[in-house]
Interface confidence: low
């Protein structure tokens, strides 16, 4: 467990008065419909709130929306609906906020049936002013910003046209027709699939994958017989139909689609799917669905090229294409992921990996907790976490697990303690060491959020009744204070704090209901006076991440290196501050077999760190298709895990020879690829 000073819960002094002076109420002059909230930029304090209200009339639906703006983190709001000419904004497109601190915002308006095209309102000054623009098409999707240049936008039209703007939506050009899916890649590249015959649905598996690197002046066909494609990290993936049957396989490219290799993954049939669970520049977690309506599949982890895959986890819960999976990247500690498996008896169990999918284990049972009715042995069981799947099944779970990169080691989640996830009312658990150990933090379901990089945790009870109390903790969830933020309870709808967990402001959203009307209301609480002083050196202590055996010289080594962090002492009540940067000291570890994955043609028997040859490939030359050339592999079965930084120690031999023979893998060889210009 992370360092903490065991002490009786001390009350934060005079907190009621301090918080009362920093609690700001705003009542919105709206009938209660729906409300959506977006932060514009980072550390700007600018929030946009869009409220919409639908009145279903006999012949049509009459809609009304209002736009509000705050520039002080939600303490005060100004009605700016007149800036968008009191137009009804379509909520299904949301508010398209530009990347980084561009200050750009696009709102898509509802237009009457007979109009030639849609209408947008654009702002490039953090929503101080808006420009109305009529579009030459009806948008099907929200405007998508290029990650590299926020002036470049793309959108699909209801008639499957791909439209691009180079001047932040002022002027639009249709660069291609018959487009099913379009995505920005790196360097302002656009990838998209097109159909030749009937429609996206009819041509599924016969689509073409195209690329334009100059916003539609010229195009290159980079794939045929495409079912779908996806981008993850530096990898471009395409699922491609096989020549002879209805199965499809994953192909991967690391050069924007110029050359492709077939991923060493199982092929899937019509009813199955692939899903990229997580990807970075080093590697990919790929889910491959099982045949049949099982609701589970297998997780594979890739090598650094995205080609060779190791089986990581069996019976991984993933309901259907685009369905629910509990796969969660624990962002507060490197290498940690949590997900759910569907066991043989159809119960759902939580698994955790601390080494990027190398090994999975159950979550340790929290101290001082009892095993529930799902446990066969009342003394031996595990913690099971509720995530997306529980929420989709309408369980009493208001929030998914929460972790933040700058709140090192902290993970908060709803869960139950037993042999499997239970449908009974869950409690909230916290880990302060990235998931190695857990303690019950709050009884019953709550909404929760992390402020000031972990210096404060705020929670609100999940209740069907109106609420007026917020709970907060300054010691990573050990002790809690309660604050009554209003005399008149509200029907709570959500907690909002600035993304990134650096803020000290929290907004409580809800509505009040009187005899005749109901209105939106927000309470913004600033905790700056609770954390009165800035943290100093003495407030921090050294913590070794992934430490399980302090006696071992290699303790804390994960993916070839260990990291020591400066962590805030639990007993320190002070501000990390908005400019807080996580301080860490990495040190390289010696290589062991654990730092290598099994190479193509090899596998690891269970509970063994050695890689052995697959029986069916014994004595065969290991040749595979890579970048359209046949390669010959000389290996003793090991390949370094992507992102592993170990040095020295064990060093298995590996060599790849180019056989100078052309090969294709049910896919485009370079000669077949064509280019064209407009």
């Amino acid at each position: 467990s992370a360092p903490g000073e065991d002490e009786e819960c001390g009350r934060v002094r005079d907190f009621v008065a301090k918080l009362a002076n920093n609690t700001h109420q705003h009542v919105f002059d709206d009938l209660r419909g729906s409300v959506s909230l977006s932060w514009v930029g980072d550390s700007t304090g600018v929030i946009l709130v869009l409220t919409t209200f639908h009145v279903p009339l006999v012949i049509m639906t009459f809609g009304q929306s209002k736009l509000y703006r705050s520039e002080d983190y939600g303490k005060n709001f100004k009605d700016i609906t007149d800036l968008i000419n009191n137009t009804f904004i379509r909520t299904e497109f949301g508010m398209a906020i530009g990347p980084e601190n561009s200050g750009k915002v696009v709102l898509t308006a509802e237009v009457s049936g007979g109009s030639r095209g849609g209408r947008i309102f654009r702002s490039s000054d953090f929503a101080k002013n808006f420009v109305q623009t009529d579009l030459p098409f009806h948008p099907l999707t929200q405007m998508m910003y290029s990650p590299q240049n926020s002036d470049y936008l793309l959108a699909l039209s209801t008639e499957n046209g791909l439209w691009v703007s180079k001047n932040f939506g002022g002027k639009w050009e249709e660069i291609h027709k018959a487009v099913c899916l379009a995505k920005w890649g790196s360097d302002n590249t656009i990838f998209f699939t097109t159909y030749a015959n009937g429609s996206c649905k009819a041509d599924l598996g016969a689509l073409e994958l195209w690329r334009t690197s100059d916003l539609g002046k010229s195009f290159k066909t980079i794939g045929v017989k495409i079912y779908s494609f996806g981008l993850g990290g530096r990898f471009l993936f395409a699922s491609v139909m096989a020549d002879k049957d209805t199965t499809r396989r994953i192909h991967v490219s690391t050069d924007q689609g110029d050359t492709w290799s077939m991923a060493q993954l199982p092929s899937v049939g019509q009813e199955q799917f692939y899903s990229i669970l997580a990807a970075n520049d080093d590697m990919v977690f790929m889910h491959v669905d099982e045949p049949g309506d099982t609701g589970f599949g297998t997780i594979f982890t890739s090598d650094d090229r995205g080609i060779v895959y190791s089986k990581s986890l069996d019976r991984h819960l993933y309901t259907t294409t685009g369905g629910e999976t509990d796969f969660t990247n624990v962002t507060s500690l490197r290498g940690v992921y949590i997900t759910s498996v569907l066991s043989e008896d159809n119960s759902i169990q939580t698994m955790i990996t601390f080494d990027q999918g190398g090994r999975w284990t159950h979550l340790r049972k929290p101290e001082n907790s009892e095993c529930d009715a799902t446990a066969k042995n009342k003394n031996e069981c595990s913690l099971h976490i509720h995530a997306s799947y529980s929420i989709s099944q309408k369980l009493n779970v208001p929030m998914a697990p929460l972790s933040e990169p700058n709140a090192v080691g902290i993970v908060i989640a709803h869960g139950s303690v037993g042999d499997a996830i239970s449908v009974m009312v869950p409690d909230v658990y916290i880990s302060d060491d990235g998931g190695y150990s857990w303690t019950k933090m709050l009884e019953g379901p709550h909404y929760y959020t992390i402020l000031d990089s972990g210096g404060i945790i705020v929670a609100i009870e999940h209740s069907s009744r109106p609420i007026n109390v917020i709970k907060f903790s300054t010691d990573e969830g050990q002790c809690w204070q309660t604050y009554t933020f209003t005399r008149d309870p509200i029907y709570f709808t959500g907690l909002a704090s600035e993304p990134g967990a650096r803020s000290m402001n929290i907004s409580i959203w809800g509505f009040t209901e009187s005899f005749l009307t109901s209105q939106w209301v927000s309470y913004t609480i600033d905790f700056k006076d609770i954390l009165e002083r800035n943290c100093e050196e003495k407030d921090y202590t050294i913590w070794l991440a992934h430490s399980t055996d302090p006696e071992d010289y290699e303790d804390g080594c994960i993916l070839g290196y260990k990291e020591q962090f400066l962590r805030l002492r639990k007993s320190s009540v002070c501000q990390n501050g908005r400019d807080y940067v996580v301080t860490k000291q990495p040190s390289i570890c010696l290589c062991s077999l654990e730092d290598f994955l099994c190479d193509f043609g090899y596998y690891r028997p269970e509970n063994d760190s050695k890689c052995v040859e697959q029986p069916e490939l014994k004595g065969h030359d290991l040749e595979f298709c890579l970048y359209g050339r046949e390669e010959h592999l000389t290996t003793n079965g090991y390949r370094k895990i992507p992102g592993d930084k170990c040095q020295g120690g064990v060093n298995p031999v590996r060599e790849v020879k180019d056989l100078k023979k052309k090969c294709t893998s049910n896919f485009l060889s370079p000669e077949k690829q064509n280019s064209k210009s407009n």
């Epitope: 049949g292 309506d293 099982t294 609701g295 819960l317 569907l342 043989e344 008896d345 159809n346 119960s347 759902i348 529930d372 009715a373 799902t374 799947y389 099944q393 369980l395 037993g418 042999d419 499997a420 996830i421 239970s422 449908v423 009974m424 009312v425």
Partner: antibody
């Protein structure tokens, strides 16, 4: 639609065995437990046990242990309950019932789909 | 084994009445309790699972409450098709056990 169809009525002599079948359709057979429940004339419901069609695993009520065998044939989506050494007080309607899976969680397995029942009469 | 005791064993009521049936477990069963309706010559039908969750397709006039040892099934406004026998069932611990049943008759 989802349904369970059971085999027809049986008349047996004391000491004999009876095997009742339950054919499932309209859902993934392996994904839900199959329970067996019986009801003697004019009496309440009595749980006998379950079979997990996925793995073939079983759990029987203590009262029937040693006399009951629950099996399944996944190729034809059918569950079976065989009761041996029949006595006259085994005269009852025998039901198969699908355990409500509730998307995978253990939640007390309410039984959400029932067969029409098979009447077993034990008489000399 | 956990004993499930239902009360009353029978009751007479009129269409439109509010009817309450209780079920008591001999030890705590958390919320692992289900309610069924059975009509003569027919198989039981699941009404409520996990103490208070309404099974899909079941009218909203049926509701369940309780946890631990005491549970209640309520029919807010009795309809002609509701005259039947009602059973509670626990499934916290094996063996699963049913209550003795409550017969709801026309007054």
């Amino acid at each position: 639609q989802v349904q369970l169809v059971q085999s027809g009525a049986e008349v047996k002599k004391p000491g004999a065995s009876v095997k009742v079948s339950c054919k499932a359709s309209g859902y993934t057979f392996g994904a839900y437990y199959m329970h067996w429940v019986r009801q003697a004339p004019g009496q309440g419901l009595e749980w006998m046990g379950w079979v997990n069609p996925n793995s073939g695993g079983t759990r029987y009520a203590q009262k029937f242990q040693g006399r009951v065998t629950m099996t399944r044939d996944t190729s034809i989506s059918t569950a079976y309950m065989e009761l041996s050494r029949l006595r006259s007080d085994d005269t009852a309607v025998y039901y198969c019932a699908r355990g409500k899976r509730s998307s995978g969680w253990y939640e007390g397995y309410g039984m959400d789909v029932w067969g029409q029942g098979t009447t077993v009469t034990v008489s000399s | 084994d956990i004993q499930m005791t239902q009360s009353p064993s029978s009751l007479s009521a009129s269409v439109g009445d509010r009817v309450t049936i209780t079920c008591r477990a001999s030890q705590s069963i958390s919320s692992y309790l289900n309610w069924y309706q059975q009509k003569p010559g027919k198989a039981p039908k699941l009404l409520i699972y996990a103490a208070s969750s309404l099974q899909s397709g079941v009218p909203s006039r049926f509701s369940g409450s309780g946890s631990g040892t005491d549970f209640t099934l309520t029919i807010s406004s009795l309809q002609p098709e509701d005259f039947a026998t009602y059973y509670c069932q626990q499934s916290d611990v094996s063996p699963i056990t049913f209550g003795g049943g409550t017969k709801v008759e026309i007054k």
